[in-house]
Interface confidence: low
């Protein structure tokens, strides 16, 4: 290889060893018959070499340095070239540099062809291995913009006071042009401006000069985007850190079109805007820091660009102001996306301020509209309390658990809706009563309706799930004794048409001392499943739930215990079942410890099936599933 | 990538209440799993506190009675431990983790942990 | 609550070499719904304990097959196939069949 480097060129080339620090074993640079680790070849010098070994692209490397000096001449603008050529230089990883000096008046303006430039962060890496790194100049010290790979959206970097541009190929890269061109600007009279241009859909993440490090003191950064007027833009801020300030405010300003309050001023910490139509500016101020304890300002950003999707002209009112105790959150459910660009999905506040989740709160009116693709990818949570804990005037009052219709005219899928039912300690209980009988899900008859309701007694340190319950069954009743949840959950798109003709109604009635009654009306048809609360994890110690089953008149009612034995060892106290008719008062009482569980029984009348606890002992837990059958009486044995 | 990151102060004086935040994301703490506080004494003893499920659960190690409670907020996608009486015994490194509590059955994820001294 | 006896304390190895722990509990870890919730942790110096062996013998996804579990009776051991050096910390087995979940006192892993 020959390279020759013109005087006054001002490109000087260094052909290095990747890892100085490690030894070469055979691979030397062959030059006038020395053999050397390095090679520099400056303006005006011709140097003719070879490498003592076939591969030398894992051994060395070639950067190539350009000084361009706008201080004593003009500038030369225009289209910059590759010098050396990619066919006069050895086949090596090369990095140029061109090193751009220029007074602090001038602005200089750095234009990339297509493909643009695309953004990385630390860490990060281009898949063709061809990297641009741009750094400028305040006063003697050096500040990165940016590190960047192609196809992007960033087409132009302003800045002031000079440049240095890095331009990484990696050996094999057939790349021969340089991509960019300069130009002369007036001054900026900031720190750089980055211009990204959308033609289309599609995302850009951005970052601070010298990221992840800290941007420099009252310094002053904007960013240009150029967004087709049929898109809508919308700002997150991935990553960020505040230094401590001095004087003045570090935050971020928005410039947008047809903005009646322009510049728009927002903090770090604050919402940022969403649904912004064309093009906007966003501007990041540094402060004067606090000199003993700096701190570091930082962020990183992302804009995302997207259709407006038919609902974002559509504005929903969420009516919470006559709620003290409701919250409704939207937010994504949780599922991972296979395609390459996924548009944002924002749920957005008063139609500017957008986020991935929002949740309402009570007392107020809430304007909401969407920006999202898909809105199936959202959906609802929503919590109420019902605190119901002067016994002396609640005693005796109903109240109807039904979603709101505000609620269910949104467009987003209802998931949750949650009920916390509080109630005075040993004073009162609570009484469900559904529109629809319910049926109790297991595994044996698993529901398969488009909603249920999961019910649970909320007390601090027992965790008691009474079970998942839904519409078409034979429960009649469910009495709970102390502060419970009641959870609508939905499971099928269509729940709407069902959940507006059942009504869940909660009763507040006189104290109990079981844990839970449930009363339950067979019907004919179907066997009725049922199993004890905290199925899987055992009944709570010392406690008792009984069935309360009506058994018609023209019928008769077969139990059946699922297990032969119920699998209980106590630790302390005893644990039984009681079996009894409710007519004639006879009653069955069986151990559930050393005893085999009843065999299948018949009853003529309606009876009770009562089980109480011991303190069972680790893993010997009681839990208990029966069915019950109704055959029609063929003699009546009254 | 679900990553569990827990906050709060590094001493307490005895009968104090120690209060911890588990910050989740990466996961929506309302969608699935059991949000667990497990700690490590020094010698490296490790003891279960308790947890709040995806679903509002509790349940709590008996060892610790009364004085544990764990909330959580949604809206931060946060969850928390409050352990009240806190002795010099309550020094210890304390782990936020997340247990799938249907699947594996396991304790999948675990926060870095955050050390925890009670002096006064 | 269920104590879990894990041995060795100590189990010193060269690398290359099968480790074998042990981890006994007095009462049975079946849950009632069927599954033993016996789970096998590893923790190295300054970090979070990682999920290794869950429900006695399935491998936790990116965990590699040297690991393996196993059960007899009330008995559940881990075994490492050939010891690698990032194998080395302190092992732990812990029960979350019932309440409260416990944890084994811990085997150190470390080379002779």
């Known amino acids: 290889s020959e390279i020759a480097l013109p005087r006054g060129s001002d490109i000087t080339v260094h052909i290095k060893l990747v890892s100085p620090a490690l030894p070469v074993k055979f691979c030397y640079i062959v030059v006038s018959r020395q053999h050397v680790t390095e090679l520099t070849i400056r303006p005006g010098e011709r140097k003719s070499f070879t490498f003592s070994c076939n591969n030398p692209e894992k051994h060395y490397v070639l950067k190539i340095e350009k000084n361009i000096d706008c201080m004593s001449g003009p500038c030369p603008f225009g289209e910059v070239r590759l010098q050396p050529s990619k066919s006069e230089l050895p086949i090596l990883n090369r990095t140029y540099i061109w090193d751009v000096r220029a007074h602090k008046s001038i602005g200089l303006e750095l234009q990339f062809a297509t493909p643009r430039l695309r953004q990385i962060g630390p860490g990060e890496s281009c898949a063709d291995g061809v990297t641009h790194s741009i750094s400028g100049h305040i006063d003697a010290t050096e500040v990165r913009i940016g590190t960047f790979c192609s196809n992007g959206t960033v087409s132009r970097i302003k800045m002031q006071e000079g440049v240095k541009m890095a331009l990484h190929l990696p050996w094999f890269h057939p790349r021969n042009i340089s991509g960019f061109s300069i130009a002369n600007r007036s001054s900026i009279k900031r720190l750089c401006i980055i211009e990204s241009v959308f033609e289309g859909e599609g995302s850009a993440t951005l970052m601070s000069a010298n990221y992840p490090g800290g941007f420099p003191e009252d310094e002053l950064m904007t960013w240009q985007f150029v967004v087709p007027a049929h898109l809508r833009a919308s700002v997150s801020f991935l990553n960020f850190n505040v230094s401590n300030c001095e004087r003045k405010e570090e935050r971020v300003e928005y410039y947008i079109p047809g903005s009646t309050t322009n510049p728009e001023v927002f903090r770090l910490e604050d919402q940022q805007p969403g649904n912004m139509a064309g093009n906007f500016n966003l501007s990041l101020q540094g402060c004067d820091q606090d000199a003993q304890s700096p701190g570091i300002l930082r962020l990183q950003f992302q804009v995302l660009v997207q259709r407006p999707q038919n609902e974002s002209n559509i504005t929903y009112m969420v009516d919470l102001s006559q709620e003290r105790t409701m919250s409704l959150t939207i937010e994504p459910r949780p599922v991972k996306h296979g395609r390459r660009f996924v548009p944002g999905c924002f749920v957005c506040l008063d139609s500017r301020t957008c986020s991935t989740n929002v949740t309402l709160t009570a007392g107020s009116k809430h304007k909401i509209s969407f920006l999202c693709d898909d809105l199936a990818r959202l959906w609802m949570n929503v919590e109420k309390t019902l605190s119901c804990l002067d016994h002396r005037y609640y005693y005796g009052k109903s109240f109807n658990l039904q979603v709101p219709k505000d609620i269910l005219q949104l467009p987003v899928q209802l998931h949750d809706f949650s009920w916390k039912l509080l109630v005075p300690k040993d004073r009162l209980g609570l009484m469900l009563v559904p529109g629809q009988k319910l049926q109790q899900h297991t595994r044996e008859r698993p529901c398969n309706t488009s909603f249920g309701y999961q019910v649970a007694s909320t007390t601090p340190g027992q965790d008691l799930y009474f079970g998942s319950f839904c519409p078409g069954g034979s429960i009649e009743k469910i009495q709970v004794k102390q502060n419970s949840s009641v959870t609508l959950r939905t499971y099928a798109p269509g729940f709407q048409q069902e959940v507006s003709k059942q009504v869940l109604t909660v009763s507040l009635i006189p104290y109990f001392k079981e844990e839970g009654i449930f009363t339950v009306t067979p019907d004919s048809k179907n066997k009725v499943y049922l199993r004890s609360p905290n199925w899987d994890r055992g009944l709570p110690a010392l406690s008792s739930v009984s069935w309360n089953i009506s058994v018609p008149s023209n019928q008769v009612a077969c139990l059946t215990f699922f297990r032969e034995r119920s699998g209980l060892a106590c630790q302390s106290g005893r644990a039984f079942m009681i079996i009894q008719e409710q007519q004639t008062r006879a009653e069955e009482i069986f151990s559930l410890e050393e005893e085999v569980l009843p065999k299948p029984s018949f009853h003529h009348h309606s009876f009770w099936v009562n089980i109480s606890n011991c303190s069972p002992m680790n893993g010997k837990q009681l839990d208990l599933l029966f069915w019950v059958t109704l055959t029609p009486r063929t003699v009546d044995l009254t | 990538e679900v990553k569990l990151v827990e906050s709060g102060p590094g001493l307490v004086k005895p009968s104090q209440s120690l209060s911890l935040t588990c910050t989740v994301t990466?996961?929506?703490?309302?969608?699935?799993?059991?949000w667990n506080w497990i700690r490590q004494f020094p010698g490296n003893k490790l003891e279960w506190m308790g947890y709040?499920?995806?679903?509002?659960?509790?349940s709590y190690n008996p060892s610790l009675k009364s004085r544990i409670s764990v909330t959580r907020d949604t809206s931060k996608n946060q969850f928390f431990l409050q352990l009240k009486s806190v002795t010099i015994e309550d020094t210890a490194t304390y782990f936020c983790?997340?247990?799938?509590?249907?699947?594996?059955?396991?304790?999948?994820?675990w926060g870095q942990g955050t050390t925890v001294t009670v002096s006064s | 609550e269920i104590v879990l006896t894990q041995s060795p304390l100590s189990l010193p190895v060269s690398l290359g070499d099968q480790a074998s722990i042990s981890c006994r509990s007095r009462q049975t870890l079946v849950h009632t719904n069927g599954n033993t919730y016996l789970d096998w942790y590893l923790q190295k110096p300054g970090q979070s304990p990682k999920l290794l062996i869950y429900k006695v013998s399935i491998r936790f996804s990116g965990v590699p097959d040297r690991f393996s579990g196993s059960r007899s009776g009330t008995d559940f051991t881990l075994k490492i196939s050939r010891v690698e050096a990032e194998d080395l910390g302190i092992y732990y087995c812990f029960q979350g069949s019932h309440v409260p979940w416990t944890f084994g006192g811990g085997t150190k892993l470390e080379i002779k």
């Open positions: 983790a997340g247990g799938d509590y249907y699947g594996t059955g396991a304790v999948d994820y």
């Open positions: 990466g996961y929506s703490i309302t969608s699935d799993y059991a």
């Open positions: 709040i499920s995806y679903n509002t659960y509790t």
